[in-house]
């Protein structure tokens, strides 16, 4: 993978027709930031600027607008927002920040409401949104941020909303809060300094007994020469009811620990950007996948990492030792005193004593950190969001597939082989303006990922199998969603009955998978061409033989007959071979790719001259042929002839 990290095998530029994509936009609407999939998977609810939308995503192609309800910030709040020196152009609007399914008939939504957070229930009727009634709009402080640029997170668990956001206009008072439902409203205590003033929340993930919050904040427990940011996981118990005298209406089970995502001997990736849970059959083996960047730009470029954390490891750290603050030295050290009962954060049902609560107020930071497994480290890219799913290969093996949104508007599809580093199947540039990916939502039933941007929503089918036109290319792609169907001779999406199909997720080796009959027993190091393109030379013209670079992971060379053309003697320009008609120029030219130890012809040309036709090599007798015209340039100037066929670069 080199110092850059894995390269995407295939790259699609914005507007490249070879990657099936569709884009939803709506005149006058912007900031498609919040995405929610309906329980049946057929409707995508979208929180945009001053509106909530319901999109029908049942059919392939552009999502269809079912209906849209406006929810603008009121004139009163817009006026106040402008008075408070905020921008009427960019800030004094209602940016929808929370959108959750409350029950079968209602969504719950919150927005910034021109720096005056507000929430409301939205009634559903046959998955259509009913208009918002102004007398049903409630205070949303602690549920939505004031400022649209502030990070936030929220998750609905058992009818209660757990949210992490900024709780004041200035953006200096972070809060973790539980609202809705029958349990008492609970908050973190600002005065106890459980959270640093700059805490920035990126995810909330429920587990069996607790809810985990993922965030970054300035570290207080290290002596460092510059302000050091640190990533954290915090837990609160679902059954927490707050204290009776001490910690009234406050969490009594709040604990936090450091998350570590680093390669051995390297500076850590210390800024968490997003995290998701990939559930497993057994909760103990479930893992959390998180995207990190670093506050240090190595070599002047941003880099990103994806780390996996096991729930078991997180639980173990929260059951371990605490740190405590030495008031004299203002240093955090390991607490070595006696245990209190019930132990803070243990989710025991009984009422906690004043002694236990007093202890809890000061012992909320865990001594150990949760160490993640780095699965993907990539420089020159800043990942902003991720979505993760498990895909079953042809052999029944399970593969983790990650979809990673970047700060420049592209989507990376990464595959994590079992107990190994990730590789990148493809990179798709979605935004022509390099706008960042705001959100990602997997829609498994639709086989697609939806990516929210400032200007609209991209629907990205999870795989693009049909672009791999040969068995070799299909197998080398190592996309768990794709396999080669020898019958139809197509690379297709895996479906139910795929017995004779070809795929090699483990090695990605076409040598064993794609050869049939006697060749299977004695594999050849290079496969024969599938098609020969016949080209006629034109006197006094330079022929240009294009070679489409189908894979960024392959190395390419040209051969003439059975001999490799040396780099020194050939004129290769942008991958194309340039030929001057002269004696001995005719015959078979092949652009050969070598990838994963396997060589295969990407394109084969038979060059013939009008005055001296050549007999085709008998070994190639069975290979289909096609007469083509290639670009040519007259020697001594003149126009270049247009090719009949265009060759697309990846």
């Amino acid at each position: 993978t080199g110092g850059q990290g894995p390269m995407p095998r295939v790259k699609y530029h914005a507007g490249d027709g070879h990657r099936a994509l569709s884009f939803f936009q709506q005149k006058g609407l912007r900031d498609f930031d919040t995405l929610l999939l309906s329980d049946d998977g057929n409707t995508l609810y979208v929180g945009a600027r001053e509106a909530v939308l319901a999109l029908n995503i049942q059919n392939p192609g552009i999502p269809r607008l079912k209906n849209m309800i406006p929810w603008p910030a009121s004139e009163r709040k817009k006026t106040e927002c402008a008075f408070k020196k905020k921008s009427n152009e960019t800030q004094c609007f209602n940016f929808i920040r929370v959108l959750v399914s409350y029950n079968a008939t209602h969504l719950y939504a919150c927005g910034t409401f021109a720096f005056s957070p507000a929430c409301t229930f939205i009634e559903l009727q046959d998955s259509l949104l009913l208009p918002i009634l102004i007398d049903k709009v409630m205070d949303g402080k602690g549920q939505s941020p004031f400022d649209p640029v502030h990070k936030h997170t929220a998750v609905l668990v058992d009818g209660m909303l757990y949210s992490g956001t900024m709780n004041n206009f200035l953006g200096s008072e972070p809060i973790l809060m539980r609202t809705l439902g029958s349990q008492p409203v609970l908050k973190t205590d600002i005065f106890l300094r459980w959270l640093h003033a700059d805490a920035s929340f990126v995810a909330a993930i429920p587990s069996t007994q607790v809810v985990y919050f993922f965030f970054e904040e300035t570290a207080s427990e290290f002596d460092f020469f510059e302000e050091l940011y640190i990533s954290r996981v915090a837990q609160v118990c679902k059954n927490d009811v707050g204290g009776e005298k001490l910690l009234q209406k406050k969490w009594t089970t709040f604990l936090k620990a450091q998350l570590l995502c680093a390669q051995p001997g390297q500076l850590p990736f210390n800024i968490i950007r997003h995290a998701v849970l990939l559930p497993a059959d057994s909760p103990s083996v479930s893992r959390i996948y998180a995207v990190f960047t670093s506050q240090w730009q190595v070599g002047g470029t941003r880099s990103s990492a994806v780390c996996a954390f096991s729930l078991t490891d997180i639980e173990r750290v929260f059951k371990g030792k605490y740190k405590e603050l030495n008031k004299e030295t203002s240093r955090w050290t390991t607490y070595r005193g006696s245990e209190v009962s019930p132990r803070p954060g243990s989710c025991s049902m009984g009422p906690s004593s004043d002694k236990a609560l007093t202890f809890m107020k000061d012992h909320f930071l865990m001594d150990e950190h949760v160490v993640g497994t780095p699965l993907l480290v990539k420089s020159g890219v800043e990942y902003t969001r991720l979505a993760v799913e498990s895909a079953r290969g042809l052999d029944g093996s399970s593969h983790v597939v990650m979809y990673l949104g970047t700060s420049t508007g592209s989507l990376h599809k990464a595959v994590v082989p079992q107990d190994s580093s990730a590789y990148l199947v493809e990179e798709i540039q979605l935004s022509p303006d390099s706008e960042p990916v705001r959100n990602l939502q997997l829609a498994p039933a639709q086989g697609a990922v939806f990516a929210g941007f400032s200007g609209g929503i991209w629907r990205v089918p999870r795989a693009n199998c049909s672009v791999y036109e040969s068995c070799v290319d299909c197998v080398l792609a190592r996309d768990p969603h794709c396999a080669w169907d020898p019958e139809s001779r197509l690379c297709s999406l895996l479906s139910g009955s795929t017995k004779p199909w070809k795929q090699d997720m483990e090695r990605g080796n076409p040598e064993w998978v794609c050869t049939r009959g006697p060749m299977a027993r004695s594999p050849r190091r290079q496969s024969p061409p599938q098609l020969i393109k016949e080209v006629l030379t034109v006197p006094n013209s330079i022929l240009e033989l294009p070679c489409p670079h189908l894979s960024a992971l392959a190395s390419y060379h040209w051969s003439h007959g059975r001999a490799k053309i040396s780099e020194a003697s050939a004129t290769v320009y942008n991958g194309s071979l340039l030929l001057l008609p002269q004696d001995g120029v005719g015959g078979l030219y092949q652009c050969v790719a070598t990838e994963n130890g396997y060589s295969y012809p990407v394109v084969s040309y038979w060059v013939d001259s009008q005055d001296q036709p050549l007999a085709l090599d008998p070994e190639l007798a069975g290979v289909p042929r096609e007469r083509v015209q290639v670009p040519l340039t007259r020697v001594g100037g003149g126009a270049s002839m247009a090719a009949q066929r265009s060759y697309w670069p990846h």
Partner: antibody
């Protein structure tokens, strides 16, 4: 129930300052703006200004800028108005009034009983 | 500065419907003026009745309603009662400040 308690009267010298209080109870103080209104004997009501109790942002009637300063103390759920450089023109009853108008409109529902300020040497 | 004008006095009988109005010197009153109606009873007892043109304050009897009639804001008391005898002030919002009217003295005879 909601109550806004104001001291009954203040007697102050011309040129001096006075700081009057408005203690709120029966609701979450920081959820509502607080308005201040002046009533001179035999005259109508004049709006002085208002304060957003959650972030101490203030909005003043141009006429009272420099004269009135609005503040809050969240811990005691109390709003304050300080009047400076007092003259006989400032002799009046001063009311605090809660704004219950939520997100969509302004509305003053609960009023204090007023503080009568007399400026006299 | 805008001037807000109200009837100086009105008289009604118990059970009758009476409408008090509020005019702005700058033109028609609109919902953006968030018309407020406040009742003053003896001993400086002020109570907010209506906010934002037509929103009744919590605990205010349903006989009080606010609206826009023509180019003015209006307070209507449907079935006036003797305890409604008071001075009623209207206040209008002008994008960054409030202006109160002079008040209407309502007598219920």
């Amino acid at each position: 129930q909601v109550q806004l308690q104001q001291p009954g009267a203040e007697l102050v010298m011309p040129g001096a300052s006075v700081k009057m209080s408005c203690k709120a109870s029966g609701y979450t103080f920081t959820d509502y703006w607080m308005h201040w209104v002046k009533q001179r004997p035999g005259q109508g009501l004049e709006w002085i200004g208002a304060i957003d109790t959650s972030d101490s942002y203030t909005s003043y009637n141009q006429k009272f800028k420099g004269k009135a300063t609005l503040t809050v103390d969240e811990s005691s759920s109390t709003a304050y108005m300080q009047l400076s450089s007092l003259t006989s023109e400032d002799s009046a009853v001063y009311y605090c009034a809660r704004d219950y108008g939520n997100f969509y409109y302004y509305a003053m529902d609960y009023w204090g009983q007023g503080t009568s300020v007399t400026v006299s040497s | 500065q805008a001037v807000v004008t109200q009837e100086s006095a009105l008289t009604t009988s118990p059970g009758e419907t009476v409408t008090l109005t509020c005019r702005s010197s700058t033109g028609a009153v609109t919902t953006s003026n968030y018309a407020n109606w406040v009742q003053e009873k003896p001993d400086h007892l002020f109570t907010g009745l209506i906010g934002g043109t037509n929103n009744r304050a919590p605990g205010v009897p349903a006989r009080f309603s606010g609206s826009l009639i023509g180019d003015k804001a209006a307070l209507t008391i449907t079935g006036a009662q003797t305890e409604d005898e008071a001075i009623y002030f209207c206040a209008l919002w002008y994008s960054n400040h409030w202006v109160f009217g002079g008040g209407t003295k309502l007598t219920v005879l």
